[in-house]
């Protein structure tokens, strides 16, 4: 029977700069029941506080609700592991909420095949930003990435969409069912998880265009860029 091993705070994330959660990995338990507590202070202060909510984030976590979250302050935190034989402390972790934002995935991904009479058909997709993010305040700039693949393909084709919430692509395989997903990230943060896959059957009469893919910066009337397959393989990871 031994004192507990050293725990490690390995991740802190905020969905929207208004709340955040940190998670730790326990060290060895020393063969005895072990209690964990997270304590923190704000940089420039000496007053220590204990984690306000050990429940919301699941096991081995600390959740900071709105009233405990300040955007302009750095948090200094550590985890204490204690059993009957003694204690051990994690290293201190410095957390600035501005840099730990990981939004929820975008919502309402809509995918349609458009077949205008006068132009080549294309796949059009649009989506909405996650509900927790208020883009109107200017606190956030969200960047988007979409990926798609035929249902049975192992490799995804990924496209960076910038700040736009619409996108269109030529060059699809007729008669295939495609999966499409979208994710987002703030300018100083982490990519969200991918949204659930939306799927669409490409008609058998869809005209394949091998040479080019179309990427639009806005709606149908917006600026359009034609990118060759060679460029695409160079600029977009698969």
């Amino acid at each position: 029977q031994l004192p507990p091993g050293k725990p490690e705070i390995f991740k802190c994330r905020s969905p929207n700069k208004e709340t955040f959660t940190c998670w730790w990995r326990p060290g060895t338990d020393g063969g005895l029941p072990t209690n964990y507590s997270l304590t923190y202070h704000r940089e420039g202060e000496t007053l220590m506080h204990e984690c306000p909510d050990y429940i919301t984030g699941g096991p081995n976590s600390c959740h900071f609700g709105k009233q405990y979250t300040s955007m302009w302050r750095t948090y200094v935190m550590m985890v204490n592991a204690t059993n009957q034989m003694g204690s051990s402390f994690s290293d201190e972790l410095y957390v600035d909420v501005t840099y730990i934002v990981q939004p929820d995935p975008p919502l309402e991904l809509t995918v349609e095949v458009k077949q205008p009479e006068d132009r080549k058909p294309y796949l059009w997709m649009k989506w909405s930003p996650p509900t927790l993010i208020d883009l109107k305040t200017g606190w956030f700039t969200l960047l988007y990435e979409i990926r798609l693949k035929p249902e049975k393909a192992a490799e995804w084709e990924t496209h960076f969409a910038g700040q736009q919430t619409e996108f269109k692509i030529l060059s699809l395989h007729p008669g295939q069912k495609y999966l499409v997903q979208v994710r987002c990230k703030p300018d100083h943060g982490y990519w969200s998880a991918w949204s659930p896959a939306t799927f669409i059957q490409i008609p058998s009469d869809f005209i394949m265009n091998d040479e080019q893919k179309l990427i639009s910066e806005e709606d149908l009337g917006g600026e359009q860029k034609l990118i060759s397959e060679e460029d695409l393989h160079h600029h977009h990871h698969h």
Partner: antibody, heavy 114, light 107 residues
Framework: QVQLVQSGAEVQKPGASVKVSCKVS????????IHWVRQAPGKGLEWMGN????????IHAQKFQGRVTMTGDTSTDTAYMELSSLRSEDTAVYYC???????WGQGTLVTVSS | EIVMTQSPATLSVSPGERATLSCRAS??????LAWYQQKPGQAPRLLLY???TRATGIPARFSGSGSGTEFTLTISSLQSEDFALYYC?????????FGGGTKVEIK
């Protein structure tokens, strides 16, 4: 012909863990993200989570936080779902489901009883 | 979490008649909605995805409509094999959720 074949029925005691397997054929696991769905006797369907073998990412319903682990072995095209700290209300048929929802395993009955 | 509400809980219909099943989402799910049929002792079977696109092998008597928060599954002329449980499910965002189901029984 895509098929998902699951492991057989299990009886477990409260507090124990169960690991259900889902063997994919007619497809490679790397191309197929897997959902796990369960159905308690006489009840509706409940989504548990999703495992994407391509990047190893998992997403799960909040109620299973800390209890469910979804993994996959791409060398055998097999996905796994492990549920720990079992209680009687976890008694259910557990299904693995392909990403587009048109491929379902046959289901695995897990009974939790002392 | 988006709550999916199906109505009615039970629908009694005569063979050959039309059945209309409703599914309501607590917030918009765009067209990211699927319908399933489940018979006793069997896994669910996908009928429709994208709110209105029939899955492979599904007869034309099954049709779906709606977007946003209100969705409908219509079975134009019920066959004996259509008497079963029907579920809707959204895949708009995590977590995915199912409706409570509608049982279509013989009148």
């Amino acid at each position: 012909q895509v098929q998902l074949v699951q492991s057989g029925a299990e009886v477990q005691k409260p507090g124990a863990s169960v690991k259900v397997s889902c063997k994919v054929s007619g497809y490679t696991l790397t191309a197929l993200s897997i959902h796990w769905v369960r159905q308690a006797p006489g009840k509706g369907l409940e989504w548990m989570g999703n495992f994407d073998p391509g990047d190893g990412e998992t997403i799960h319903a909040q109620k299973f936080q800390g209890r469910v682990t979804m993994t996959g072995d791409t060398s055998t095209d097999t996905a796994y779902m492990e549920l720990s700290s079992l209680r009687s209300e976890d008694t259910a048929v557990y299904y693995c489901v392909g990403v587009t929802f048109d491929y379902w395993g046959q289901g695995t009955l897990v009974t939790v009883s002392s | 979490e988006i709550v999916m509400t199906q109505s009615p809980a039970t629908l009694s219909v005569s063979p050959g008649e039309r059945a209309t099943l409703s599914c309501r989402a607590s917030q918009s799910v765009a067209s990211n909605l699927a319908w399933y049929q489940q018979k006793p002792g069997q896994a669910p079977r996908l009928l429709l995805y994208g709110a209105s696109t029939r899955a492979t092998g599904i007869p034309a008597r099954f049709s779906g409509s709606g977007s946003g928060t209100e969705f409908t599954l219509t079975i134009s002329s019920l066959q004996s094999e259509d008497f079963a449980l029907y579920y809707c499910q959204h895949y708009n965002n995590w977590p995915l959720t199912f409706g409570g189901g509608t049982k279509v029984e013989i009148k």
